[in-house]
Amino acid sequence: FPQTTEKISPNWESGINVDLAISTRQYHLQQLFYRYGENNSLSVEGFRKLLQNIGIDKIKRIHIHHDHDHHSDHEHHSDHERHSDHEHHSEHEHHSDHDHHSHHNHAASGKNKRKALCPDHDSDSSGKDPRNSQGKGAHRPEHASGRRNVKDSVSASEVTSTVYNTVSEGTHFLETIETPRPGKLFPKDVSSSTPPSVTSKSRVSRLAGRKTNESVSEPRKGFMYSRNTNENPQECFNASKLLTSHGMGIQVPLNATEFNYLCPAIINQIDARSCLIHTSEKKAEIPPKTYSLQIAW
């Protein structure tokens, strides 16, 4: 049967390919739970770390500068970019029906939690997404520390602040700065960028079972680790690519159910810093060692 579908409502059609939407959502959930899962579930602490790393764990003070100073004195610890050292997928792209780009074989471990990371619009605790795959993996850090020399000062007691510097018309540079906290961990073995080997183990959850594909040597748990410089970061998907990768048409409005399919990809993209570029110091027009926002939408 053809894959495209149409909504049964007057003057409304939708090109959603539900098979692709489900598989792609599962893929992104798998990435997130691989990074933040613990014992095959997303603990409150793991969930807290995810929120922390996507920058919504606490109120942040934002400063927007309208002077055109192109060389603010920003410093980052580039060793601790917020990228996973084993979860990069530059080819994870699909087009409307099934353009066959590989996801790569990133096997993750886990059982099934009932709830997707994006909440339902109309559902109880049973959850929306039966495909959430959880697993083990090291956590993505905030930047270890940073100094800033900006006109509007921020209270030294504030743990995290977000600073926008207007570098040129319509362009902003985002830096999230976090003072180091006691007890931050630096895992010893974080250099491997290869996916886990496929070794079958079995686990059972309340409602279903997952036989896990685990690696023999997984990245040790920790909040911070560095990324290999030769890795390709996950591609920054704009709106069209997000839709087509989930088998959705780009010319029609999204309803809540369709948007729900996109939630894990959006979170994964934020968490992986897919749309931030660690710019070269050679580029005079851009402040050194600054994460710039790609024009993705």
């Epitope: 598989s23 599962q26 049973s126 409602l207 997952r210 594909n213």
Partner: antibody, heavy 113, light 107 residues
Framework: QVQLVQSGGGVVQPGRSLRLSCTVS????????IHWVRQSPGKGLEWLGV???????DYNAAFISRLTISKDNSKSTVYFQMNSLQAEDTAIYYC???????WGQGTLVTVSS | EIVMTQSPATLSVSPGERATVSCKAS??????VVWYQQKPGQSPRALIH???YRYSGVPDRFSGSGSGTDFTLTISSLQSEDFAVYFC?????????FGQGTKVEIK
């Protein structure tokens, strides 16, 4: 054209294992998950499990102890193995892509001595 | 597991008439429901997904509605080729579960 072609099945003795194959064309196993469902007169349609794009598997808890789903992406083939079959496992077994659109032709498995 | 209960088990309808099949979930499944048609000796054919989306190629006399726990498949004007067994399935929670089927037969 999307197709799922199943092979294997037939008569299996009680206590023995069943191995089925599902070879797909028209799409990639790195893009879509493949589900297994069975249908019997007594129990109707039962979802058994799925293998996702990255190789992870989710199983119906009722079958996890004796079910293994694997795949070979290069061969575009998914493998289904169920151990310790009993008479009540007699059914038509289907592979399917996603919860909906494309199903294999089904293969009848009869567990009998 | 979520139990999907279909009613009626058998529906006797004359050609040209409307047929309505009901499916009730034992807990909220949002709109994660698909409807299948199955004819003897054939694999199930998906008609509707996400409770109310019709696959292209499926005649517009088939429609689906509902969310949460109550779902309905409606065939507005039965044609001879529509006499078959219809199943609902939820894919909100593991294990994905099916209704027991509703046989739509000629009256």
């Amino acid at each position: 054209q999307v197709q799922l072609v199943q092979s294997g099945g037939g008569v299996v003795q009680p206590g023995r294992s069943l191995r089925l194959s599902c070879t797909v064309s028209g799409f990639s196993l790195t893009t879509y998950g493949i589900h297994w469902v069975r249908q019997s007169p007594g129990k109707g349609l039962e979802w058994l499990g799925v293998i996702w794009t990255g190789g992870t598997t989710d199983y119906n808890a009722a079958f996890i102890s004796r079910l293994t789903i694997s795949k070979d992406n290069s061969k575009s083939t998914v493998y289904f193995q169920m151990n310790s079959l009993q008479a009540e496992d007699t059914a038509i077994y289907y592979c399917a892509r996603g919860p909906s659109s494309y199903w294999g032709q089904g293969t009848l498995v009869t567990v009998s001595s | 597991e979520i139990v999907m209960t279909q009613s009626p088990a058998t529906l006797s309808v004359s050609p040209g008439e409307r047929a309505t099949v009901s499916c009730k979930a034992s807990q909220n499944v949002d709109t994660n429901v698909v409807w299948y048609q199955q004819k003897p000796g054939q694999s199930p054919r998906a008609l509707i997904h996400s409770a109310s989306y019709r696959y292209s190629g499926v005649p517009d006399r088939f429609s689906g509605s509902g969310s949460g726990t109550d779902f309905t498949l409606t065939i507005s004007s039965l044609q001879s080729e529509d006499f078959a067994v219809y199943f609902c399935q939820q894919y909100n929670n593991y294990p994905w579960t099916f209704g027991q089927g509703t046989k739509v037969e000629i009256k």
